[in-house]
């Protein structure tokens, strides 16, 4: 069986200033079990976009209904965008574990760019 | 109930040291951003540092950047400024302050720590 | 860096009549702006952020207005109890992020 994929489709994204972010992500497998979180930038100092097992992330909807059995589309729509939203976008797939869950599978993020508002 | 309560405040000479700790409950820590913002006497709110929800990401005022540290521990729902080299313009109520999201406004505010520096 | 200008420094208002606070950016912040509430002795306290909302447990006497570079907060009819500082916030561009330097409520 082949081992899961994360695609992240875009390399690259622009959005006006106050519009909505689709940053789409989808896996190949629903194996292995574990929550899927998205971040802006990678390394240590990357920031918790969306954690799919537990948070409150008030400015991201998600596309598909996460929880829907067999549900492969973890895509996500970000509000009310602003400058400092700038960066590229990691969709990760985590492996369930304990106490913690651990990393599996990064896809190789998208560029989410912002252009000022027109006047 | 959201909660924020900071301890570790004093009074100390200046040139020495002194750590804050704040303590959450009540909402995912390790999901929020968080920040520590101080106030002098009679004076408005200054803006002191950042930390991301998984810790490795920060930033911090000019004004204190090379002698504050801040860290958080997630298994321990506990936020960090470590204070060195401390001046008597430092001489302040600090409190820690919950992040909404990744990018946006203090939503919930500890009830501070005051730290005063004199000789 | 985002300079917030807060305006009047101080506000002396009757009980039942209406304050009017301003905020203005140096340069746009969309409607990336906050509002808190600090009484004496007491920490801050969110009251309105994206320039509109009313947080939980404000009451309605409280409403924001604005965006771009400027916002106003406006209390329909004071009470004793709102005799505070009130602080805008912007987190548009970060960091920093940036205070205005407050108005002051008094009640007359």
């Known amino acids: 069986e082949d081992e899961l994929q994360v695609i992240q489709p875009e390399k690259s994204v622009s959005v006006a200033a106050g519009e909505s972010a689709t940053l789409r992500c989808a896996m190949t497998s629903l194996i292995p079990v574990g929550p899927i979180m998205w971040f802006r930038g990678a390394g240590a100092g990357r920031e918790l976009i969306y954690n799919q097992k537990e948070g409150h992330f008030p400015r991201v909807t998600t596309v598909s209904e996460l929880t829907k059995r067999n549900n492969l589309d973890f895509s996500i729509s970000i509000s009310n965008i602003t400058p400092a939203d700038a960066g590229t976008y990691y969709c990760v797939k985590f492996r369930k574990g304990s106490p913690d869950d651990v990393e599996f599978k990064s896809g190789a993020g998208t560029e989410l760019s912002v252009r000022a508002k027109p006047s | 109930d959201v909660q924020l309560v900071e301890s570790g405040g004093g009074v100390v000479r200046p040139g020495e040291s002194l750590r804050l700790s704040c303590a959450a409950s009540?909402?995912?820590?390790?999901?929020?951003?968080m920040n520590w913002v101080r106030q002098a006497p009679g004076e408005g709110l200054e803006w002191v540092s950042r930390i991301n929800s998984g810790g490795g990401g920060t930033d911090y005022a000019e004004s204190v950047k090379g002698r504050f540290t801040i860290s958080r521990d997630n298994s321990e729902n506990t936020l960090y400024l470590q204070m060195n080299s401390l001046r008597a313009e430092d001489t302040a109520v600090y409190y820690c302050?919950?992040?909404?999201?990744?990018?946006?406004?203090?939503?919930?505010w500890g009830l501070g720590a005051l730290v005063t520096v004199s000789s | 860096e985002t300079v917030l200008t807060q305006s009047p420094a101080t506000l002396s208002v009757s009980p039942g009549e209406r304050a009017t606070l301003s905020c203005r950016a140096s340069?746009?912040?969309?409607?990336?702006l906050a509002w808190h509430q600090q009484k004496p002795g007491q920490a801050p306290r969110l009251l309105i952020y994206d320039a509109t909302n009313r947080a939980t447990g404000i009451p309605d006497r409280f409403s924001g207005s604005g965006s771009g570079t400027d916002f106003t907060l406006t209390i329909s009819s004071l009470q004793t109890e709102d005799s505070a500082v009130y602080y805008c916030?912007?987190?548009?561009?970060?960091?920093?992020?940036?205070f205005g330097g407050g108005t002051k409520v008094e009640i007359k």
């Open positions: 340069q746009t912040v969309g409607s990336k």
């Open positions: 302050a919950k992040q909404y999201d990744w990018n946006g406004f203090f939503d919930y």
């Open positions: 009540g909402f995912s820590f390790s999901s929020h951003a």
């Open positions: 916030q912007q987190y548009y561009y970060w960091p920093p992020y940036r």
